[in-house]
């Protein structure tokens, strides 16, 4: 289970039309459910029920986004429509280039994601917890456009913000 280095870049526009980027670094783990490779895309937060249906007639959202899914405590979600692995597969089917699970409330999901799969997804499936998950939640709560860059080696520069 290799460390996944995740950089989240927030884009904040100013009234003048310029924008500032804020980069936050956090770490997770690549799970065996997916590939250990780099990926990058705009963050799309997936509601637990938003991955349930499988309407073939529906258009794909678009390709190349990074899905973020918060998992609830198993006792508070006793009959999920899909397994954690199923949710990852559904997100990738719908165009995700990577999936990040917040497993803070559901650490059992780590084992589910790391069970040796005969057919792992060809995209990375990362899990985060604790302080890193809180960082991620705070970012998606800011309501700004954000991109996630997932790497399997540390980024070269320290995380900082800079003006464009």
């Amino acid at each position: 289970k290799e460390t996944a280095f995740v950089e989240v870049v927030l884009f904040e526009s100013s009234p003048s039309g310029d924008y500032t980027t804020y980069t936050t670094g956090l770490t997770g783990r690549f799970s065996r459910a997916g590939a250990t490779l780099s990926a990058e895309g705009e963050i799309v937060q997936m509601h637990p029920l938003g991955l349930c249906n499988n309407n073939d007639e529906e258009d794909l959202y678009e390709y190349g986004w990074v899905g973020v899914v918060k998992l609830e405590q198993p006792e508070l979600d006793p009959k999920p429509c899909l397994t954690v692995l199923g949710k990852a597969k559904r997100a990738v089917q719908r165009g995700a280039t990577a999936v990040i699970f917040d497993v803070s409330e559901n650490p059992e999901a780590i084992d589910q994601l790391n069970q040796g799969s005969e057919d792992p997804l060809k995209r990375p499936v990362v899990y985060v917890k604790g302080a890193d998950a809180i960082k991620l939640m705070n970012i998606v709560n800011k309501q700004k456009v954000a991109r996630a860059r997932i790497q399997h080696r540390p980024p070269r520069q320290p995380t900082e913000y800079f003006d464009m």
Partner: antibody, heavy 119, light 107 residues
């Protein structure tokens, strides 16, 4: 600040199609799911359907054959189309939003648009 | 589908009183219950979520409790501004069912 505002025709004839628009501002479709709820005159609230952050949809099974929800992210608009209208479809139609980080309630609602189905 | 049964449908109380509204789910909804207030001519507004968490800006006179299939909204020290219809709602499964509503009026 967060705003949702519904618009559409006030009067529609039976058997026709209703088209409503929800204009949103102050939040991103990437993080929020937009739902539609209606309220017949003097009655309670009925959930109609949702368009999720990923663009896929779910509908109230009772209305699924007649209902379609879509969106235009570039214009920050969500659309509701309900066909084969009956008089029982008369009511106030609301759009609202739900944060996608786990299970969350509807934290902001539009003001609603009154739709009357009558000949 | 899970049914939400709300009672009473109508409630009349005096200013300063405490009142309770109950919501019964046809199966265990694990605390995923919200309460909304709808004043005449307005859209509903979120009061309480996850059974007992108060939405930002809502007075502390409003409180929620319950578990399993039984849930309660309590309004303490009733104020004129509380005249409204109150709805419960489950929000962890389709079809996000609402209770039938409780209309509150001041005696």
């Amino acid at each position: 600040q967060v705003q949702l505002k519904e618009s559409g025709p006030g009067l529609v004839q039976p058997s026709q199609t209703l088209s409503l628009t929800c204009n949103v501002s102050g939040f991103s479709f990437n993080y929020y799911n937009v739902h539609w709820v209606r309220q017949p005159p003097g009655k309670g609230l009925e959930w109609l359907g949702v368009i999720w952050s990923g663009g896929n949809t779910d509908y109230n099974s009772a209305l699924k054959p007649r209902l379609r929800i879509s969106r235009d992210t570039s214009k920050s608009q969500v659309f509701l189309t309900l066909n084969s209208l009956q008089t029982e479809d008369t009511g106030i139609y609301y759009c609202n939003r739900m944060w996608g980080y786990g299970y969350n309630p509807f934290d902001y609602w539009g003001q609603g648009v009154m739709v009357t189905v009558s000949s | 589908d899970i049914q939400m049964t709300q009672s009473p449908s109508f409630l009349s109380a005096s200013l300063g009183n405490n009142i309770t509204i109950t919501c019964h789910a046809s199966q265990d909804i694990k605390g995923w219950l919200a309460w909304y207030q709808q004043k005449s001519g307005n859209a509903p507004e979120l009061l309480i979520y996850k059974t007992s968490s108060l939405q930002s800006g809502v007075p502390s006179r409003f409180s929620g409790s319950g578990s399993g299939t039984e849930y309660v909204l309590t309004i303490s020290n009733l104020q004129p501004d509380d005249i409204a219809t109150y709805y419960c709602q489950l929000y962890h499964s389709f079809p996000f069912t609402f209770g039938s509503g409780t209309k509150l009026e001041i005696k």
